[in-house]
Amino acid sequence: AILGRSETQECLFFNANWEKDRTNQTGVEPCYGDKDKRRHCFATWKNISGSIEIVKQGCWLDDINCYDRTDCVEKKDSPEVYFCCCEGNMCNEKFSYFPEMEVTQPTSNPVTPKPPYYN
């Protein structure tokens, strides 16, 4: 392992899709991939009228957008389907939405919003 990097070997697995097909829908997924490629965990979910509906969680493969992210955080503003990825075993157990604010001149003291965490 490279010093300072969290090697991802397993991720929390969930597939809402499988419920209707009576297949095991939750567990721990071992992540496989080329030796020279990085592996990550991900979570994807929807916000239906304030209620969080997890769609999928599991392993994600070598994606520069996931490099060195220890927390699973969605930063896009109001996506239709939320997605985050991270590095480190089971790092997708918790995920959050923390939109990056557009940089504008503050009219008052800026407040850093705390990301809501889901698990």
Partner: antibody
Framework: QVQLVQSGAEVKKPGSSVKVSCKAS????????ISWVRQAPGQGLEWMGG????????NYAQKFQGRVTITADESTSTAYMELSSLRSEDTAVYYC?????????????WGQGTMVTVSS | EIVMTQSPSSLSASVGDTVTITCRAS??????LAWYQQKPGKAPRLLIY???QLLSGVPSRFSGSGSGTHFTLTISSLQPEDFATYFC?????????FGPGTKLEIK
């Protein structure tokens, strides 16, 4: 690197069943996601279902529900697809395929295919 | 069932050209979209997964983009070995479905 080797071509009568095998070489067979995809002559691709051997329960496309059975034997690293009540429209090449991940990111390793011909 | 459509159904191009194939899903599939190449008598080969991730060993002239319902596969600087049929596939929701294919022929 996983390799998938399928059983040979079959000729079947309408109404009968066929069972195609797919032997995996390489490690971790039990925790791979194995899917079955078919392709009728000159036609497109059709996903039939899949299985993660350690879980044992298969996930089927509604179209084939009740007619297809997908199983896996961890001791021999072999997956099976059985299709019953065969009709002429089932004439196709049947592929077993490994998925990149359990959440089906992409079908990255394909068997060589098994031609199943249904004819009276 | 999510229906996948592809356009064009066939196209002719020359070596060195850049071509773009479009795939549309009848419902949103987020980024659960893969692209395959198939040559006659052979099994399909995965090129791109997760809409834009290039599979290891696939030449960088292949690229994918899109999310939701609209996706594209671009092949830049076409090589003789690229003339084949290309399929998209969604794996967001069962049954996983494929597009009807785009046949890329040499002009």
């Amino acid at each position: 690197q996983v390799q998938l080797v399928q059983s040979g071509a079959e000729v079947k009568k309408p109404g009968s069943s066929v069972k195609v095998s797919c032997k995996a070489s390489g490690r971790h067979f039990g925790s791979l996601q194995i899917s079955w995809v078919r392709q009728a002559p000159g036609q497109g691709l059709e996903w039939m279902g899949g299985i993660i051997p350690i879980y044992g329960t298969a996930n089927y496309a509604q179209k084939f529900q009740g007619r297809v059975t997908i199983t896996a034997d961890e001791s021999t690293s072999t997956a099976y697809m059985e299709l019953s009540s065969l009709r002429s429209e089932d004439t196709a090449v049947y592929y077993c395929v490994k998925d990149l991940t359990w959440t089906n990111l992409g079908l990255d390793i394909w068997g060589q295919g098994t031609m199943v011909t249904v004819s009276s | 069932e999510i229906v996948m459509t592809q356009s064009p159904s066939s196209l002719s191009a020359s070596v060195g050209d850049t071509v773009t194939i479009t795939c549309r899903a009848s419902q949103g599939v987020s980024r659960w979209l893969a692209w395959y190449q198939q040559k006659p008598g052979k099994a399909p080969r995965l090129l791109i997964y997760a809409a834009e991730q290039l599979l290891s060993g696939v030449p960088s002239r292949f690229s994918g983009s899109g999310s939701g319902t609209h996706f594209t596969l671009t092949i830049s600087s076409l090589q003789p070995e690229d003339f084949a049929t290309y399929f998209c596939q969604q794996s967001y929701s069962t049954p996983f479905t494929f597009g009807p294919g785009t046949k890329l022929e040499i002009k």
